[in-house]
Amino acid sequence: MMTGTIETTGNISAEKGGSIILQCHLSSTTAQVTQVNWEQQDQLLAICNADLGWHISPSFKDRVAPGPGLGLTLQSLTVNDTGEYFCIYHTYPDGTYTGRIFLEVLESSVAEHGARFQIP
């Protein structure tokens, strides 16, 4: 029986050009984590496999860094990075656990402009 739960950072926002850490945490289970996938709806971003180590998809090689831990760091963010990210924990003997993070990448100038000229 699957007793574990995935905790994620939930909905997060970051500025264009900046970086963000995607983090999931599996709790309430003694199952062994053997692989963690970081995915978008259409493609795999990265995998951390207990035996094979990290694999970063070639299309993200330049701006994705493994870690910290089982997390993933996205760098040089663009507005196109806005969207859903999934962590998929492969565990033994439980099976797979999934977490979802929604990232919104904001135009930094818009964010600054909005802060400066707020109407009271």
Epitope: Q35, E39, Q43, N49, L52, H55, S57, F86, I88
Partner: antibody
């Protein structure tokens, strides 16, 4: 228990359009993509495309050259696949499927579409 | 698009035999490969995902291995009910692609 129940067999004439439904139960419909897979008689599996009911986004296999449209009705937990400008090569069983992003633990029973004049 | 080249296209084996099917991806997909079993007139059934993870309820005689471009699916001791067609699929990226299938028959 997760179930995907598809509409019944169809016979269509060349040039016509067919629309197949896939009614989902046993999980939150908006949580997972619904994919469609074609299998011609005696042939292998060909991915057609998907819909993500959470935001209505979809992606298609270019092989179907804009002839396929996948939609979802979140009020009835039903996905639809419409294939237009039918030709004899479209005679096939069409499956809806879902699971973990891009691998499929759950499949519909299949819908046979026969294209014949 | 990622091509999946599956071999053999058909094979005949005896009950109790060890059966191996291979799949080669046209580019590195790390461990993003699934294997399905399909019996005539039925929908495919997921057996293996992420190259080596058995799906819930799948008997232990079915296993998968490999990473990068070369993948193997094995039935350790063939049973009469294993007669079916088996397909590999890459789940690395859209568009999803399947191998052409391996039809397994009993000798």
């Amino acid at each position: 228990e997760v179930q995907l129940v598809q509409s019944g067999a169809e016979v269509k004439k060349p040039g016509a359009t067919v629309k197949i439904s896939c009614k989902v139960s046993g999980y939150t419909f908006t949580d997972h993509t619904i994919h469609w897979v074609q299998q011609a008689p005696g042939k292998g599996l060909e991915w057609m495309g998907y819909i993500y009911p959470r935001d209505g986004s979809s992606k298609y296999n270019v092989k179907f050259k804009g002839r396929v449209t996948i939609t979802a009705d979140t009020s009835t937990d039903t996905a639809y696949m419409e294939l237009s400008s039918l030709r004899s090569e479209d005679t096939a069983v069409y499956y809806c499927a879902t699971g973990m992003l891009r691998w499929f633990a759950y499949w519909g029973q299949g819908t046979l579409v026969t294209v014949s004049s | 698009d990622i091509q999946m080249t599956q071999s053999p296209s058909s094979l005949s084996a005896s009950v109790g035999d060890r059966v191996t099917i291979t799949c080669k991806a046209s580019q590195d997909v790390f461990t993003a490969v699934a294997w399905y079993q399909q019996k005539p007139g039925k929908a495919p059934k997921l057996l293996i995902y992420s190259a080596s993870y058995r799906y819930t309820g799948v008997p232990s005689r079915f296993s998968g291995s490999g990473s990068g471009t070369d993948f193997t699916f094995t039935i350790s001791s063939l049973q009469p009910e294993d007669i079916a067609t088996y397909y590999c699929q890459q789940h690395y990226s859209i568009p999803l692609t399947f191998g052409a299938g391996t039809k397994l028959e009993i000798k």
